[in-house]
């Protein structure tokens, strides 16, 4: 090779100067006994290149770029031969921005994959390769003492969660959770999180049924649906509470809420609705009094309240 | 300290009838599920039945179905078992068991022997 | 119903070995799997919850591991007090039912 490129930094700061050198050694110098070497930073070529012959024999070409402002562009040395350009060296340049700190990180517990799924903002673009590592440690106190520490979490490329299993996790006991942002201009991270996995638990919510009208059962009075809910099995020794969303099939009406219930409230009268009207209804749940994540809604049931007009409103429920 | 404690147990001829009581301390009683298991002699443990923690959901064994009734008074933070039609296939140390929020039995009483027998 | 299979119903062992008691489920229990210890004569004490979460104050060397349908309870150096039967049991829906017992005994 007849020349060599040698640069301050082969990453930046986006708008950052840079300096790049560029050397043609002896042997090469009968393509022209004064040869003149030119820039090029993508296909512009670059004025300003100050051009020396050095004790060797060799000759130099330095530029000083004031602000590259491509996140990506290959920079290039090149000599007139003829009617072309001969290209001796290019290297690439990339300017971009340290991490940004990831934000919003937030974490659930999911009892059916035995995970802990944590979740993070990770700020604006750095235009570099940006690595993300989920770092935790296991605490016996409020995070201020660190236990062991736990595995790295690192999500696939693009994403910006990432899964704990359960052998790393301890149940019951706080965890230091955190974000580690890295790329070529720097290191951040995010402010810790120390919670107990069960205190984020995320439940499935409940199956709501319509209840199976029974003999002895006082049919519904008018503008009243009656249901019962089926709770999600492997949450059932957990206390919860839930509540009850409805709204008329047609219509641009909004959700009407209804709640707290408890999950052992496995029916219930909701009254106090149109006549004559079919209502979509969802229910969802928390862990509670302690700390938890609401369920997702349950898949809607859809019932309609009977004809008649109702002669009073109100909610009430059977145990 | 978590403490269970087991009584009402005895000799009962079998059709006979028997009510075990469990008396808890140390915790908040009425924020747990609390159940019952039994052990024959010389056998396996055997899940008998559970109560949830404001006695609204009551699941059984078939074995027990129809015959043994599970409550509880939260007031008094005391946990029952009335059997009924008692057999002799019933006869076995009756435990009483505190549950943790994954179904884990994580505190047990010392038991109480029930024996069926004419 | 979802059974539990126990093995082996008994072992024999010395002081300082590894011992390994497996327990199948008859169909997927995610993780709630349990393990218990009770010794003649005495209630069983709550050894490791959730397949893998070791009971307060119980002692490092027990641990449990797998998920799914095949679980293993490991204890890593046997000692004295850990004589005793081993039972697991799936706490995922009712009935909750236990393995038969593994019977740990000294060679």
């Known amino acids: 090779e007849c020349g060599h490129i040698s640069v301050s930094a082969p990453i930046v700061h986006l708008g950052d100067p840079i300096t790049a050198s560029c050397i043609i050694k002896q042997n090469c110098s009968h393509l022209d006994p004064e040869p003149q070497i030119l820039w090029r930073l993508g296909a512009e070529l670059q004025p300003g290149g100050r051009q020396q012959r050095l004790s060797d024999g060799t000759q130099e070409s330095i530029i000083t770029l004031p602000h590259l402002n491509h996140t990506q562009a290959f920079l290039s040395c090149a000599l007139n031969w003829g009617n072309s350009l001969q290209i001796l060296d290019q290297v690439e340049l990339r300017a971009g921005y340290p991490p940004a700190i990831p934000h919003n990180l937030s974490c659930l517990m999911n009892l059916t994959t035995s995970s802990l799924i944590c979740q993070w903002e990770p700020g604006p673009e750095t235009h570099l390769p940006t690595s993300f590592t989920l770092k935790s440690f296991k605490s016996r106190g409020n995070c201020q003492t660190q236990g062991d520490s736990i595995l790295d979490c690192v999500p696939k490329d693009g994403q910006s969660h990432c899964s704990i299993p359960r052998k790393h996790l301890l149940l019951y006991q706080n965890m230091g959770i955190w974000v580690q942002a890295e790329n070529a201009l720097g290191t951040s991270m995010s402010p810790q999180l120390c919670l107990d996995p069960m205190d984020v638990v995320k439940l499935e919510p409940p199956m709501l049924r319509t209840m199976d009208p029974s003999p002895e059962a006082a049919p519904p009075q008018a503008g009243c649906l009656q249901l019962s809910w089926e709770p999600w099995q492997p949450g059932l020794h957990i206390n919860q509470k839930c509540e009850l969303r409805h709204k008329p099939q047609r219509g641009e009406a909004s959700w009407a809420l209804v709640g707290p219930l408890p999950l052992e409230a496995l029916q219930y009268e909701l009254c106090g609705l149109l006549p004559a009207t079919a209502y979509t209804l969802q229910i969802r749940c928390i862990r509670w009094p302690l700390p938890g994540h609401w369920s997702d809604w349950s898949p809607s049931l859809e019932l309609r309240t009977t004809e008649r007009a109702p002669t009073h409103h109100h909610h009430h429920h059977h145990h | 300290e978590v403490q269970l404690l087991e009584s009402g147990g005895g000799l009962v001829q079998p059709g006979g009838s028997l009510r075990l009581s469990c008396a808890a301390s140390g915790f908040t009683f009425s924020l747990y599920w609390m159940g019952w298991v039994r052990q024959a002699p010389g056998k396996g443990l055997e899940w008998v039945s559970s109560?949830?923690?404001?006695?609204?959901?009551?699941p059984y064994a078939d074995s027990v179905k129809g015959r043994f009734t599970i409550s509880r008074d939260n007031s008094k933070n005391t946990l029952y078992l009335q059997m009924n039609s008692l057999r002799a296939e019933d006869t076995a140390v009756y435990y009483c068991?505190?549950?943790?929020?994954?179904?884990?039995?994580?505190?047990w009483g010392q038991g109480t022997l029930v024996t069926v027998s004419s | 119903d979802i059974q539990m299979t126990q093995s082996p119903s008994s072992l024999s062992a010395s002081v300082g070995d590894r011992v390994t008691i497996t327990c199948r489920a008859s169909?997927?229990?995610?993780?709630?799997l349990n393990w218990y210890q009770q010794k003649p004569g005495k209630a069983p004490k709550l050894l490791i919850y959730y397949a893998s979460n070791l009971q307060n104050g119980v002692p490092s060397r027990f641990s449990g591991s797998g998920s799914g349908t095949d679980f293993t309870l490991t204890i890593s150096s046997l000692q004295p007090e850990d004589f005793a039967t081993y039972y697991c049991q799936q706490s995922i829906q009712y009935p909750q039912m236990f393995g038969g017992g593994t019977k740990v005994e000294i060679k």
């Open positions: 068991a505190k549950l943790g929020e994954l179904g884990q039995s994580s505190a």
């Open positions: 109560i949830s923690s404001s006695g609204g959901v009551t």
């Open positions: 169909q997927g229990i995610s993780s709630y």
